[in-house]
């Protein structure tokens, strides 16, 4: 079952995904796609990184964190109801069937009608356990467990405040991390 995240229409949605590079600058290609992770690659790719940089992206989809440190969390700008659905974060670790796949379900709620200068947004997330990745063949593909639900409240939806907030660190500390090497 997919990990679920929520955002309101008009806000920015945040879908966390992390890995720990084996060495600084030793990056692993990552792709984000709309739809559950298929067997290979990502379907309906919205953003892709390679060993050096973001090499493909579409409008409204961007990486807000420091992807060079393994923060490949996806931000979707100014969401609409049509953005609801499952998203795939795929960490493309070299080797046979080594990729780590995460399906994240985004639920978009209609905007609250009561105007307010700042609105609260709730994130409810069950994060995958930390995993030290080792080579494994097709018959040994692993299913990741999940930690108990964690409730986080994000006070602001401004992108730069999100970048500077402790949310990314909180998520990383909670174990939503793949360690490479």
């Amino acid at each position: 079952s997919e990990v679920e995240y929520r955002a309101e229409v008009g806000q920015n949605a945040y879908l966390p995904c992390f890995y720990t590079p084996a060495a600084p600058g030793n990056l692993v290609p990552v792709c984000w796609g709309k739809g559950a992770c298929p067997v290979f690659e990502c379907g309906n790719v919205v953003l892709r990184t390679d060993e050096r940089d973001v090499n493909y992206w579409t409008s409204r989809y961007w990486l807000n964190g420091d992807f060079r440190k393994g923060d490949v969390s996806l931000t979707i700008e100014n969401v609409t109801l049509a953005d609801s659905g499952i998203y795939c974060c795929r960490i493309q670790i070299p080797g046979i069937m080594n990729d780590e796949k995460f399906n994240l379900k985004l639920v978009i709620k209609p905007a609250k009608v009561t105007p307010a200068p700042t609105r609260q947004r709730d994130f409810t997330a069950a994060f995958p356990r930390m995993l030290t990745t080792r080579g494994h063949g097709p018959a040994e593909t692993q299913t990741l467990g999940s930690l108990p639900d964690i409730n986080l409240t994000q006070i602001s939806t401004l992108a730069n405040e999100l970048r500077d907030s402790r949310l990314a660190n909180d998520l990383r500390d909670s174990g939503a991390t793949i360690r490479i090497g």
Epitope: G35, V39, G43, I86, P138, T141
Partner: antibody, heavy 116, light 107 residues
Framework: EVQLVESGGGLVQPGGSLRLSCAAS????????MSWVRQAPGKGLEWVAN????????YYVDSVKGRFTISRDSAKNSLYLQMNSLRAEDTAMYFC?????????WGQGTLVTVSS | ETVMTQSPATLSVSPGERATLSCRAS??????LAWYQRKPGQAPRLLIY???TRATGIPARFSGSGSGTEFTLTISSLQSEDFAVYYC?????????FGGGTKVEIK
């Protein structure tokens, strides 16, 4: 226009070998996974093998593991399937297909018949 | 492996009528499902991917639906060129697997 043209099929005795080729054109070959899919007479489609863009990952259906080898040459825009220790049950039409997890372009196929 | 079961094996339909083909997966494949058309002597042709997205050049009379384990291909008004064998294929789980096919024949 995307084109995939297979060749190399034919009649071979059980235990024999064949090498199938697929010439690709009309797209950036080096950007796509590629697959071989087969269809035995009167049967359905069966995925056989695929290969990553750079050749670093190759996957096979269990029934051909250890006997078939998929490879590619991006300089020649070509895909290959080396088939050894052929069995009667390998008799089929073999298709080369561009692989996006689903198969969006197919060749016309090349017939492999394994019989004594 | 994920076993894909198609039904019926043969569907007899008159031109102009609606055809509904079913595909069932032995385990969830999310929406990672494709449909193909195969005519004798021709290469298979991709019709639908991601369960409901029509491939380039595919007429609007072809539509796909479903997610998880139950999927449907609908041909709203059969044309003479639509009589063929149709296959579903899942790409959610390794290995990639096809259904056994449904033959749509003229009634």
């Amino acid at each position: 226009e995307v084109q995939l043209v297979e060749s190399g099929g034919g009649l071979v005795q059980p235990g024999g070998s064949l090498r199938l080729s697929c010439a690709a054109s009309g797209f950036t070959f080096s950007s796509y996974w590629m697959s071989w899919v087969r269809q035995a007479p009167g049967k359905g489609l069966e995925w056989v093998a695929n290969i990553k863009q750079d050749g670093s990952e190759k996957y096979y259906v269990d029934s051909v593991k250890g006997r078939f080898t998929i490879s590619r040459d991006s300089a020649k825009n070509s895909l290959y399937l080396q088939m050894n220790s052929l069995r009667a049950e390998d008799t089929a039409m073999y298709f080369c297909a561009r692989d996006s997890n689903f198969f969006d372009y197919w060749g016309q196929g090349t017939l492999v018949t394994v019989s004594s | 492996e994920t076993v894909m079961t198609q039904s019926p094996a043969t569907l007899s339909v008159s031109p102009g009528e609606r055809a509904t083909l079913s595909c069932r997966a032995s385990q969830s494949v999310s929406s990672n499902l494709a449909w193909y058309q195969r005519k004798p002597g021709q290469a298979p042709r991709l019709l639908i991917y991601f369960s409901s997205t029509r491939a380039t050049g595919i007429p609007a009379r072809f539509s796909g639906s479903g997610s998880g384990t139950e999927f449907t291909l609908t041909i709203s008004s059969l044309q003479s060129e639509d009589f063929a064998v149709y296959y579903c294929q899942q790409y959610n789980n390794w290995p990639l697997t096809f259904g056994g096919g449904t033959k749509v024949e003229i009634k």
